[in-house]
Amino acid sequence: ENSTSPLSADPPVAAAVVSHFNDCPDSHTQFCFHGTCRFLVQEDKPACVCASGYVGARCEHADLLAVVAASQKKQ
């Protein structure tokens, strides 16, 4: 089966699993709210790689710590 290199830990994998992965199918374009869908080969299920500033299984929550840190950096 086709697989690529493991998911990097940065950005974090919402499913908290590091594994080989495939692209998700077209049907899953809206599976992740603020991130990229990756289909985990071993677990045989989709997972989300969250965009910076988002967390949660579907990257559905803004990471308040990241928001605070970013605003402090600006100051």
Partner: antibody, heavy 116, light 106 residues
Framework: EVQLQQSGAELVRPGASVKLSCTVS????????MHWVKQRPEQGLEWIGR????????KYAPKFQDKATITADTSSNTAYLQFSSLTSEDTAVYYC?????????WGQGTTLTVSS | IQMTQSSSSLSVSLGDRVTITCKAS??????LAWYQQKPGNAPRLLIS???NLKTGVPSRFSGSASGKDYTLNITSLQTEDVATYYC?????????FGGGTKLEIK
Amino acid sequence: EVQLQQSGAELVRPGASVKLSCTVSGFNIKDDYMHWVKQRPEQGLEWIGRIDPANGHTKYAPKFQDKATITADTSSNTAYLQFSSLTSEDTAVYYCTRMGLRRGYWGQGTTLTVSS
Amino acid sequence: IQMTQSSSSLSVSLGDRVTITCKASEHINSWLAWYQQKPGNAPRLLISGATNLKTGVPSRFSGSASGKDYTLNITSLQTEDVATYYCQQYWGTPWTFGGGTKLEIK
């Protein structure tokens, strides 16, 4: 081991409603979409629609848009398929399913017979 | 996405190597399944991801992919393999199925 257990056969009158269930074990339904498929006697397979149990979002094949309602209860790890205003055309076997790349999972099917 | 099984029926002999084909109208990137169905029974999933044989399915079954063309092979047909076979794409929604290929003994 992942198992999809569907509710038993139903015999209902035309015009009535019915709700079929699919209880999943060995897999958290919030982790992926759950789908329903129809097969009429001696015919092929037809996709009805799907639900994202994590948020309740649904998507239907156009012909089932006004006929079927798919819901899910994450506390019991169960997906449901409800029909309204049943006609003889709805007589079929209905399957719940979830497909991965390496494995696929199907329920055993629920036979729905619409007859007066 | 349309899935076309060019043969609705195939006349075969026991022991034959059987090839069933399925063509997708668009690229589905191997998100394809094969099912076996016997009269009065539920479809039985044989292969997912175009090539991944489901646990418990005999090794005489195999799947392959080339572009938009997908193939189910049975190396030596057994009596219990006489059935109708369906392909299905699950790359995009709506999921779509081929019309089925029925194997009939000569």
